[in-house]
């Protein structure tokens, strides 16, 4: 059993049918040493008397809001909620595995440029009775301050019959430098409390692999004299890190027609402007990478041909 | 202000073009390592992230682009000093900080360069031949260094008279690897930056 | 006592189907996660399906993928694997098992696929 | 489609010190826990040891389990007849967990 905060604790429990459970110690917050009952959440029902408690926790009947009272007077409270360890492996009911960029991956984290600012995000198919924490540092023996905001549902989409909630949090690193090289990587985790059952999630990463540009920006086409060909031109989105001599970006313009099936003609340069032949219903799409490390492109910034 | 970089002019700044060589190189030969041996821990979640240069050079600190020297977490520890006879200077009046940084970033390919020789002699010697060094990156890697032409002490290659243990040998190359792909992100960032001003 | 008893077994066409069913006792069935795992003749253990305690996730081998169909009725506390489009290799003794660090297993129950 | 590898067969006279061992790779057993099973002829397999090395009560103590890095091995001392069977590892793979990986199996004769 450890402290989550203050008067909540979480008990650790192997979980499997007809497991012993975990005895666990409760101590009444009060210098009252005679007089005392307990009870469990909303009942009036008795558990026992005196200054502690001992219970048998088996299964979530016996989590919940222990309070120790005294002639009707409430003297405090103690809230036991459950972590599961099922066969070594610790329960992960309440958030989704999104499955990318491979299986088991519950939180997904971002960043638009190397300022030591990142977003994560995560699903859930809980609508109710829900509650994270967020907490995030740069390496774990010896950790360095990164500030992370609340959690916020941020989307709502409908699957199938299910109805998905997807939260998110962004953070910070305290003192960054865009050109450092990483050599300890950033660790995120988050609680995930639902009911009475706690959950933990640990995500742990490198900014320069969560790298994901935002679109170029300022898109525009200009028809040249005489031809079929347009130059089209762009700029350095603004949230990308500068000096842009420095944090080069590298290009991908992409002409695409209105059906689908259509080939898709594609040129990648390291300049912000291009000459394309532009046909006929087509779009002219462009997005930005990281020239030097490869991690995601960003989405694509588009303008019609005509 | 956007400078993209187009196909470097070789007279205008010569090293570009061999930085871009070596990110390519190295990229190339971590790939192939990663796949070669699948069986290791050799991707980037998996191995210690070790900095051979680190305390030696400072090229990230030296090579700090202008507009980065405002943003404080960024100047850690610049006081390392080097010599300074850079050929890749295309100007005379190149500052003291451009010829550190060069200089920096020649140092670090002097010790790169020396660890992969002592380790390819070692990987010679698996009767597995499981894996080998890309000559093409030793090869790059020279290049670069005599194109920032630096006078500097040749450090002696490393020779070890115990058995190597392939296992561990194999594990360091990926520790390398990944710490040198990293370093030429830096050099590249840093030429195109040099090249742009 | 936890008990895990398991019916339907028995013999079937190729291309027929089956349900097994697994009806669980002396324990809190609702909580916990549940497995299939099958041992073809003279063969070893091989796993074909897994529930999450309340439904709400379901994996499968590849080998039964799309043909076979994990549930659970909790209100039962019955466990089933309803499988279809039964092939020779599905031939097999059929487990159902709890989820946990100890498990319980039922008894098994023959499924023989033959023409 | 089996991961984890256990040899065909082992064999013992009564009281000699019998091992089986369970060759997996980083993201399965390096990763996670080991079970053991034992299975009789004709009956469901029966949990010998869970956590690589703990033994569930009812288990006599001439078994005992360990890991090391991507194997895991099991051990029975002083063999008896009773322990003729066959003999299953069990462990997850961290990509497909709770998929069951099950070794090849390793029948036991007592000579």
């Known amino acids: 059993i450890w402290e989550l905060k203050k008067d909540v604790y979480v008990v650790e429990l192997d979980w499997y049918p007809d497991a012993p459970g975990e005895m666990v110690v409760l101590t009444c917050d009060t210098p009252e040493e005679d007089g005392i009952t307990w009870t469990l959440d909303q009942s009036s029902e008795v558990l026992g008397s005196g200054k502690t408690l001992t219970i048998q926790v088996k299964e979530f009947g016996d989590a919940g809001q222990y309070t120790c009272h005294k002639g009707g007077e409430v003297l405090s409270h103690s809230l036991l909620l459950l972590h599961k360890k099922e066969d070594g492996i610790w329960s992960t009911d309440i958030l989704k595995d999104q499955k990318e960029p491979k299986n088991k991956t519950f939180l997904r984290c971002e960043a638009k440029n190397y300022s030591g600012r990142f977003t994560c995000w995560w699903l859930t198919t809980i609508s109710t009775d829900l509650t994270f924490s967020v907490k995030s540092s740069r390496g774990s023996s010896d950790p360095q301050g990164v500030t992370c905001g609340a959690a916020t549902l941020s989307a709502e989409r409908v699957r199938g019959d299910n109805k998905e909630y997807e939260y998110s949090v962004e953070c910070q690193e305290d003192s960054a430098c865009p050109a450092a090289e990483e050599s300890l990587p950033i660790e995120v985790m988050v609680d995930a409390v639902h009911k009475l059952k706690y959950e933990n999630y640990t995500s742990s990463f490198f900014i320069r692999d969560i790298i994901k540009p935002d679109p170029p920006k300022n898109l525009q086409l200009k028809p040249l004299k005489n031809s079929r060909q347009v130059e089209v031109s762009w700029e350095y989105p603004d949230t990308w890190s500068t000096p842009h001599s420095y944090f080069s970006l590298t290009f991908c313009v992409q002409v695409q027609g209105k059906s689908k099936r259509e080939k898709k003609d594609r040129v990648f340069t390291d300049k912000t402007s291009a000459t394309v032949i532009c046909r006929k219903n087509a779009s002219i799409s462009v997005r930005a990478q990281d020239r030097y490390y490869s991690s995601s492109w960003s989405e694509w910034a588009s303008v019609p041909c005509s | 202000r956007n400078l993209p970089v187009a196909t470097p002019d070789p007279g205008m700044f010569p090293c570009l073009h061999h930085s871009q060589n070596l990110l390519r190189a190295v990229s190339n030969m971590l790939q192939k390592a990663r796949q070669t041996l699948e069986f290791y821990p050799c991707t980037s979640e998996e191995i210690d992230h070790e900095d051979i240069t680190k305390d030696k050079t400072s090229t990230v600190e030296a090579c700090l682009p202008l507009e980065l020297t405002k943003n404080e977490s960024c100047l850690n520890s610049r006081e390392t000093s080097f010599i300074t006879n850079g050929s890749c200077l295309a100007s005379r009046k190149t500052s003291f900080m451009m010829a550190l940084c060069l200089s920096s970033i020649y140092e670090d390919l002097k010790m790169y360069q020396v660890e992969f020789k002592t380790m390819n002699a070692k990987l010679l010697m698996d009767p597995k031949r499981q894996i080998f060094l890309d000559q093409n990156m030793l090869a790059v890697i020279d290049e670069l260094m005599q194109a920032l032409n630096f006078n500097s002490e040749t450090v002696p290659q490393k020779s070890s008279l115990e058995e190597p243990d392939f296992y561990k040998t194999k594990i360091k190359l990926c520790i390398l690897l990944h710490a040198f792909r990293i370093r030429a992100v830096t050099i590249d960032r840093v030429m195109s930056y040099l090249n742009a001003s | 006592q936890v008990q895990l008893v398991q019916s339907g077994g028995g013999v079937v066409q190729p291309g027929r189907s089956l349900r097994l069913s697994c009806a669980a006792s002396?324990?809190?069935?609702?909580?916990?996660?549940m497995h299939w795992v099958r041992q073809a003749p003279g063969k070893g253990l091989e796993w074909v399906a897994f529930?999450?305690?309340?439904?709400?996730?379901?994996y499968y081998a590849d080998s039964v993928k799309g043909r076979f169909t994990i549930s659970r009725d909790n209100s039962k506390n019955t466990l089933y694997l309803q499988m279809k489009s039964l092939r020779a290799e599905d031939t097999a003794v059929y487990y159902c098992?709890?989820?946990?660090?100890?498990?319980?297993w039922g008894q098994g129950t023959m499924v023989t696929v033959s023409s | 489609s089996y991961v984890l590898t256990q040899p065909p067969s082992v064999s013992g006279t009564p009281g000699q010190r019998v091992t089986i061992s369970c060759s997996g790779g980083?993201?399965?057993?390096?990763?996670?826990?080991v079970k053991w099973y034992q299975q009789l002829p004709g009956t469901a397999p029966k949990l010998l040891i869970y956590?690589?090395?703990q033994r569930p009560s009812g288990v006599p103590d001439r078994f005992s389990g360990s890991k090391s890095g991507t194997s895991a091995s099991l051990a029975i001392t002083g063999v008896q007849a009773e322990d003729e069977a066959d003999y299953y590892c069990?462990?997850?793979?961290?990509?497909?967990?709770?998929?069951?990986?099950f070794g090849t199996g390793t029948k036991v004769t007592v000579l």
């Open positions: 098992k709890t989820h946990g660090s100890h498990d319980n």
């Open positions: 002396g324990f809190t069935f609702s909580s916990y996660g």
């Open positions: 529930i999450r305690y309340d439904g709400s996730n379901k």
């Open positions: 980083r993201s399965n057993i390096g990763y996670n826990t």
């Open positions: 956590g690589n090395d």
């Open positions: 069990q462990s997850y793979d961290r990509g497909t967990h709770p998929a069951l990986l």
